[in-house]
């Protein structure tokens, strides 16, 4: 009815789009909620974050397990009072993902 | 002054976060602007899209060249008038990216 090879290609495509940890570029300052007078060089780091598709539109690809990776970055404060400092920055790294439904907010929260 | 090895690691991290085409999961129906009574199986495909960091906050990682990839998918229209049809779907695939300044919208547009 449908060509078996085509179906195989489609299935492989589907497997690759599934919700899973994917290498993502994350902006450190916004990730850490730092004030605008603190910035980092480089401003971004590579970590794994959950992404991809779920087979129901109402489900969301969410992290089920997380590790924290330490990245060495230059922290620069403005106005420059001292030389840029090399600091270890801990960034969340998603190690497990799952398509999950949303839970209603508590009506009184 | 700074350990050469550490600087090398930081530089490599920075290179990897640079604005470039990255494999991304794209929802086909919303990509094509289809109505909610047309959907695809699988609902998502893998293509390359521009992503990553720019070294100035005012710049945006944007595509400078695009190709169109044809993906074989099942198109399902509701109400179901026929069996799901295998159709070639053309999806934009970013082949070149650049950090570009945002163009201000015309105040009267």
């Amino acid at each position: 009815f449908y060509d078996i090879e085509t179906l195989k290609v489609i299935d492989e495509e589907w497997q690759r789009t599934q919700c899973s940890p994917r290498e993502t570029c994350v902006e450190v300052a916004s990730e850490l909620g730092k004030s605008t007078n603190t910035f980092f060089k480089p401003p971004c780091v590579n970590v794994f974050r959950c992404g991809g598709c779920c087979n129901e539109e109402s489900l969301i690809c969410m992290n089920t397990s997380t590790s924290y990776i330490s990245k060495q970055l230059f922290e620069i404060s403005v106005p420059l009072t001292s030389v840029p400092e090399l600091v270890p920055v801990k960034v969340a790294n998603h190690t497990g993902c799952k398509c999950l439904p949303t839970v209603p907010r508590h009506p009184y929260s | 002054f700074y350990d050469i090895e550490t600087l090398k690691v930081i530089d490599e991290e920075w290179q990897r976060t640079q604005c470039s085409p990255r494999e991304t999961c794209v929802e086909v129906a919303s990509e094509l602007g289809k109505s909610t009574n047309t959907f695809f199986k699988p609902p998502c495909v893998n293509v390359f899209r521009c992503g990553g960091c720019c070294n100035e906050e005012s710049l945006i990682c944007m595509n400078t060249s695009t190709s169109y990839i044809s993906k074989q998918l099942f198109e399902i229209s509701v109400p179901l008038t026929s069996v799901p049809e295998l159709v070639p779907v053309k999806v934009a695939n970013h082949t070149g990216c650049k950090c570009l300044p945002t163009v201000p919208r015309h105040p009267y547009s």
């Epitope: 087979n55 129901e56 109402s58 839970v103 | 699988p42 609902p43």
Partner: antibody, heavy 117, light 112 residues
């Protein structure tokens, strides 16, 4: 044509358990979640939970977490629901339902469970 | 849990009349993705429920155009423009935005 064929009626004793089946055909079994719903007194519908046949991931309504266990057999495109420690409260009609991308779209014919001593 | 309240409980109509069923949710059904997962099902006597309308206003496969859905947020309506004998049964609204998925108590459409 999408079809969900459920197993026949069950008459069981209180405290026992029951395992019902739902055989899917007419579509790619692993591409769609399978939900289960309980209908009692011919009217009230309660959602039990769902299973993703692709990877076996399950999600249960808190109320049924200790009552129901959802499983699948991919080779036969069949979903199963086991109910344990049955009481008269569990007497009802149980449906398996395929979840389309937007909504639960196709329902099985239902499996009737009667708990009686 | 989100409570779905349907009115009326019973709706006697004459064939050819318009019928209107209301469904109210205890919380907004707007998902964080912007969609509203409010669906309508019809259960005819001795049968399993069948999907009629999905995502507020989209008719499912094979559903006649005399059926229409509308509403937003917490208030939704199913309308049947000209009731036919085959439309009789119990109508349920259901929300698929949050877990647990919940259903309305049903509205029985019967002949006057």
């Amino acid at each position: 044509e999408v079809q969900l064929q459920q197993s026949g009626p069950e008459l069981v004793k209180p405290g026992a358990s029951v395992k019902m089946s739902c055989k899917a055909s007419g579509y790619s079994f692993t591409g769609y979640n399978m939900h289960w719903v309980k209908q009692s007194h011919g009217r009230s519908l309660e959602w039990i939970g769902y299973i993703d046949p692709y990877n076996g991931d399950t999600y249960y309504n808190q109320k049924f977490r200790d009552k129901a266990t959802l499983t699948v057999d991919k080779s036969s495109s069949t979903a199963y629901m086991q109910l344990n420690s049955l009481t008269s409260e569990d007497s009802a009609l149980y449906y398996c339902i395929r979840a389309g991308y937007y909504a639960m779209d196709y329902w099985g014919q239902g499996t009737s469970v009667t708990v009686s001593s | 849990d989100i409570v779905m309240t349907q009115t009326p409980l019973s709706l006697p109509v004459s064939l050819g009349d318009q019928a209107s069923i209301s469904c109210r949710s205890s919380q907004s059904l707007v998902h964080i993705n912007g969609n509203t997962y409010l669906h309508w099902y019809l259960q005819k006597p001795g049968q399993s429920p069948k999907l009629l309308i999905y995502k507020v206003s989209n008719r499912f496969s094979g559903v006649p155009d005399r059926f229409s859905g509308s509403g937003s947020g917490t208030d939704f309506t199913l309308k049947i423009s000209r009731v036919e004998a085959e439309d009789l049964g119990v109508y349920f609204c259901s929300q698929g935005t949050h877990v647990p998925r919940t259903f309305g108590g049903g509205t029985k459409l019967e002949i006057n």
